[in-house]
């Protein structure tokens, strides 16, 4: 946005935040055993030009970020996403209250980048 | 920004919007010399609670989906973001003027999702 | 033809608000985003913001961010623009203006005066 | 921002002369310039766009050059209907900029 640009106040960059999910916050303490909650992690902050290696950009990204320069209106800046994710075990009831173990993919922010 | 959480109209969900990039309009029309520009495409709209089928959510994204409807303020929602990407050729210049056909991966969105 | 009309002139006090509004005809308002740009006396035009009529997103220039609101109704072909806070500098015309994408300014409103005194 | 900067700030001329104003920007805008002609309590009107491009109805008259930082309009031929304020516009990068203004004025 123009007050990216023009802005005293610096937006932080395209970076991981901490966060830890509680399943009871979630209302699925219920059915989930274990864990209680886990660090799930997320991704915020901007990605402006220039992005810089720490963004772990795409080729497409930076082409986006070029575009948006020019036509903030009708392009977005790339949007700062997950690159890498790690799986976790949980530890559950089925729907016929079998205790089951299973591996959940993509649960867990390990690394951000523009996208 | 504070009217895209605000706002009581709807917003398109996440998908791939048609974009037409010019190599001239970003100032590369010296050095790359095919094509004259390509169709990169790019990701935008919401990815809001329930996220559905078409959105190609991860898992992670869900559970910040329900984290970001209880704290919105703290944790953003998942942005819209490439989920497949295509390469293309382009021939250009190098450094020392020789003609070099170089293939760029991820340069082409071809499908969006909330991550 | 493309023509945008413009609310009528509008004398406030220092310290209130003024929306005017810019009627858009002869194109498709939503494939255009609508910028205002505004001009005090004997200055040089100075940008204040834009909405992207298909969505709604907004962007301020720095200089008036937290006082200028823009908006638009879709079914009306129309874009609003709000500004609070008044004070004598913001004492001006004030235009809206359709941008193309890759384009500068092509269509511009006729122009509203805004005075504010006491 | 970048700052866009135009030379004279007023000029005097007649009718049939030709005439050139400049507008220097302060950082690269490749050809991502714009010309204006505004008359009083009117808006402004588009005359050149991509630093030469004529806009459609524009007499040929006008036209523009440049490219990088340095730009020029250009009447070849100065008629009664073109003493007005003439404005640049840089849309090269976010946030858009104007020149501060030539008026054009009969000599």
């Known amino acids: 946005s123009a007050s990216d640009y023009n802005s005293s106040e610096l937006k932080t960059a395209c970076r991981k935040h901490e966060l830890y999910v509680s399943f009871q916050d979630l209302g699925w303490q219920d059915w989930i055993i274990a864990p209680k909650g886990y660090a799930a992690n997320y991704c915020d902050g901007e990605c402006s030009f220039p992005l810089n290696a720490h963004m772990n950009a795409t080729n497409h990204a930076i082409v986006q970020t070029l575009v948006h320069l020019m036509n903030p209106e009708y392009v977005p800046k790339p949007c700062c996403a997950p690159t890498k994710l790690n799986a976790i075990s949980v530890l559950y009831f089925d729907d016929n209250s079998n205790v089951i173990l299973k591996k959940y993919r993509n649960m867990v922010v390990r690394a951000c980048g523009c996208h | 920004s504070a009217s895209d959480y605000n706002s009581s109209e709807l917003k398109t969900a996440c998908r791939k919007h048609e974009l037409y990039v010019s190599f001239q309009d970003l100032g590369w029309q010296d050095w790359i010399i095919a094509p004259k520009g390509y169709a990169a495409n790019y990701c935008d709209g919401e990815c809001s609670f329930p996220l559905n089928a078409h959105m190609n959510a991860t898992n992670h994204a869900i559970v910040q989906t329900l984290v970001h409807l209880m704290n919105p303020e703290y944790v953003p929602k998942p942005c819209c973001a490439p989920t497949k990407l295509n390469a293309i050729s382009v021939l250009y210049f190098d450094d020392n003027s020789n003609v070099i056909l170089k293939k760029y991966r991820n340069m082409v969105v071809r499908a969006c999702g909330c991550h | 033809q493309v023509q945008f009309v413009q609310s009528g002139a509008e004398v406030k006090k220092p310290g209130a608000s003024v929306k005017v509004s810019c009627k858009a005809s002869g194109y498709t308002f939503t494939s255009h985003a609508m910028h205002w740009v505004r001009q005090a006396p004997g200055q040089r035009l100075e940008w204040m913001g834009w909405?992207?009529?298909?969505?709604?997103?907004?962007d301020y220039s720095q200089n008036f961010q937290g006082r200028v609101t823009i908006t638009r109704d879709t079914y009306a072909n129309t874009v609003y623009m709000e500004l609070s806070s008044l004070r004598s500098e913001d004492t001006a015309v004030y235009y809206c203006?359709?941008?193309?994408?890759?384009?500068?300014?092509?269509?511009w409103g006729q122009g509203t005066l805004v005075t504010v005194s006491s | 921002d970048i700052q866009m900067t135009q030379s004279p700030s007023t000029l005097s001329a007649s009718v049939g002369d030709r005439v050139t104003i400049t507008c220097r920007a302060s950082q690269s805008i490749s050809i991502w310039l714009a010309w204006y002609q505004q008359k009083p309590g009117k808006a402004p009107k588009l005359l050149i766009y991509?630093?030469?491009s004529l806009e459609s109805g524009v007499p040929s008259r006008f036209s523009g050059s440049g490219s990088g930082t340095e730009f020029t309009l250009t009447i070849s031929s100065l008629q009664p209907d073109d003493f007005a304020t003439y404005y640049c516009?840089?849309?090269?990068?976010?946030?858009?900029?104007f020149g501060q203004g030539t008026k054009v004025e009969i000599k």
């Open positions: 909405i992207n009529a298909a969505n709604g997103k907004t």
């Open positions: 991509k630093a030469s």
């Open positions: 203006a359709r941008r193309p994408y890759g384009g500068p300014f092509d269509y």
């Open positions: 516009q840089q849309y090269n990068l976010y946030p858009w900029t």
